[in-house]
Interface confidence: low
């Protein structure tokens, strides 16, 4: 009698997650009389697929029909496939008995599940930083197979090359998980910058995935600040104007203050949008200058974004001419009480 | 998932030198960086050091004159040489792994070896 | 060297009810580009320690949510907002701004 041989043809078959596995299995002999069964794994632990006798196994079908006289292909149909599935299963002959006794097991086919990465999702960091500074962008995708994956990084279409890249778990997974994290040095132009994270994977047929996330919720341009009078037509005022350029993001709160005493507070309102992304504002104070006394100066001082103030000084300059416009019995503040509390221009 | 064991003498002579070798199971070396920890009898926990994949290696500068980490790729193990015992250095001696990534630094001492007892007795 | 002082030095509790744990550094542990560097970790009896929290307030993996990290700068709490048998231990925190790593004194956290 001719020994009896499972043939799992196979060693290894590859689908994508959603589509239907085919397991083929082919006995030599029709005796001894006795079932098959399809097994995950092997062992006592292993999980029962597929047994002709009894059992619903909804997703399993048998390629041809098991009733049929004289049949020796046990080949079975999985369908909708999803990585849980991933593992090596076995065709096993049964000899008949009470209970039946397992007689010969094929080699084993090692079902390999394709599953597309998850759409990359680039977070930032909490905390704003200045130009000059590192700040890190990190790119999660999930539930991905086989872990093979390339991922790059893109700042405005230049690819980056500081980053660093996890693959998880490092052993054998039914998915897997990509964590990379880049550093990005920041320049005063990166307001309308953005930084890309691109996934590649076998399941995505050179269609890469791509997360996206903008430096303008990372990044904080200081301002500059420059001071300066011009006079005004009535002979006795003059303009004293606080310029605040090239800052972002708009948040500003500007107060003046004469020779170190808070004199106004403003918080930014009209601004002027610099190509780059940026903003400048404008503040101003009309002062009488018969009111002053001699070495007034008027300081500009610039909270932005919750950062400690910065400030910019200026001594009043009056011309001799002015003085002599002014009776002597002038007095009162430096800043013309009829003045606005500001203005933008 | 990844294992750490420690192995290595549980006694060692003073002034001699302690060795002691920690074993990445289930895992890579590569992007961490290999941690010995180590905690006297009933005291709290002092880092002695630490070694990146690429060798690169850090320690506590109140050891750093006695101790030496090194790293053995080929062999998914990283070591520890202890110079001058005394014992005060007896203690359970951990590996441990640190996760490193770049941008970010060190976010977590995420996996530990159960420990190994080492005492210092002549 | 960064120095971590951690308070209490004991913490009874009662299971089911809230539990917190101060940990002050020497000097600030956020960097300017936004992280905390310091974590938590708990070592139960006869445990090696494990990570409960890292860069401040993400818990680590398989930590349950009932503990929770706060605080920026030096000064920084671990909550539990109810507390369980499991939990008893010694809590420590760890500064991994700079080397030397720096762990505090510990807490022990014990069942009334």
């Known amino acids: 009698e001719e020994e009896l041989q499972v043939i799992q043809p196979e060693k290894s078959v590859s689908v994508t997650a959603g589509e239907s596995a085919t397991l083929n299995c082919t006995v030599t002999s029709l005796i001894p009389v006795g079932p098959i069964q399809w097994f995950r794994g092997a062992g006592p632990g292993r999980e029962l697929i597929y047994n002709l006798k009894e059992g619903h196994f909804p997703r399993v079908t048998t390629v041809l029909d098991p009733t049929k006289r004289n049949n020796m292909d046990f080949s079975i149909h999985i369908s909708n496939i999803t990585p849980a599935d991933a593992g090596t299963y076995y065709c096993v002959k049964f000899r008949k008995g009470s209970p039946d006794v397992e007689l010969k097991s094929g080699a084993g086919t090692e079902l390999s599940v394709r599953a597309k990465p998850s759409a990359p999702v680039v977070s930032g960091p909490t905390a704003r930083a200045t130009p000059e500074h590192t700040v890190s962008f990190t790119c999660e995708s999930h539930g991905f197979s086989p872990r093979d994956i390339t991922l790059k990084w893109f700042k405005n279409g230049n690819e980056l090359s500081d980053f660093q890249t996890n693959v998880d778990p490092a052993g054998k997974s039914v998915s897997y998980s990509i964590r990379s994290t880049a550093r990005v040095v920041l320049t005063r132009r990166d307001v309308h910058s953005q930084v890309i994270c691109e996934v590649a994977h076998v399941t995505l047929q050179g269609d890469p995935l791509r997360g996206t996330a903008n430096l303008s919720e990372a990044i904080r341009v200081p301002p500059t600040l420059e001071v300066f009078q011009r006079p005004m037509r009535a002979e006795n005022q003059v303009n004293v104007t606080c310029q605040v350029r090239k800052f972002y993001p708009q948040r500003l709160l500007l107060t003046w203050l004469e020779n170190g005493n808070v004199s106004q507070t403003e918080t930014a309102s009209t601004l002027t949008e610099n190509k780059d992304g940026t903003y400048n504002w404008r503040s101003w104070l009309l002062v009488n200058t018969c009111a002053h006394r001699d070495g007034v100066v008027l300081t500009c001082q610039v909270e932005h974004d919750g950062q400690p103030a910065v400030s910019k000084s200026h001594a009043l300059e009056v011309s001799a001419h002015q003085k002599e416009q002014c009776s002597d019995t002038t007095s009162g503040p430096v800043l013309a009480p009829t003045a606005p509390l500001g203005g933008s221009g | 998932q990844v294992q750490l064991q420690e192995s290595g003498p549980g006694l060692v002579r003073p002034s001699e030198t302690l060795s002691l070798t920690c074993t990445v199971s289930?895992?890579?070396?590569?992007?961490?960086?290999w941690s010995w920890i180590r905690q006297p009898p009933g005291k709290g926990l002092e880092w002695m050091g630490f070694?990146?994949?690429?060798?690169?290696?850090f320690y506590n500068p109140s050891l750093k004159s006695r101790v030496t980490i090194s790293l053995d790729m080929s062999m998914n193990q990283f070591s520890l040489k202890m110079t001058s015992v005394t014992a005060a250095d007896t203690a359970v001696y951990y590996c441990?792994?640190?996760?490193?990534?770049?941008?970010?630094?060190?976010?977590?001492?995420?996996?530990w070896g159960q420990g190994t007892t080492v005492t210092v007795s002549s | 060297d960064i120095v971590m002082t951690q308070s209490p030095l004991s913490l009874p509790v009662t299971p089911g009810e809230p539990a917190s744990i101060s940990c002050k550094s020497s000097?600030?542990?956020?960097?300017?580009?936004?992280?905390?560097?310091l974590d938590w970790y708990l070592q139960r009896p006869g445990q090696s320690p494990q990570l409960l929290i890292y860069?401040?307030?993400n818990r680590a993996s398989g930590v349950p949510d009932r503990f929770s990290g706060s605080g920026s700068g030096t000064d920084f709490t671990l909550k539990i907002s109810r507390v369980e048998a499991e939990d008893v231990g010694v809590y420590y925190c760890?500064?991994?701004?700079?080397?030397?790593?720096?762990f505090g004194g510990g807490t022990k956290v014990e069942i009334k």
């Open positions: 000097q600030s542990l956020l960097y300017s580009n936004g992280y905390a560097y």
């Open positions: 760890m500064q991994a701004l700079q080397t030397p790593l720096t």
């Open positions: 441990a792994r640190v996760r490193a990534y770049s941008g970010i630094g060190l976010d977590g001492t995420d996996v």
């Open positions: 070694i990146y994949d690429n060798g690169r290696t």
């Open positions: 289930g895992g890579s070396i590569r992007n961490y960086y």
């Open positions: 860069l401040g307030s």
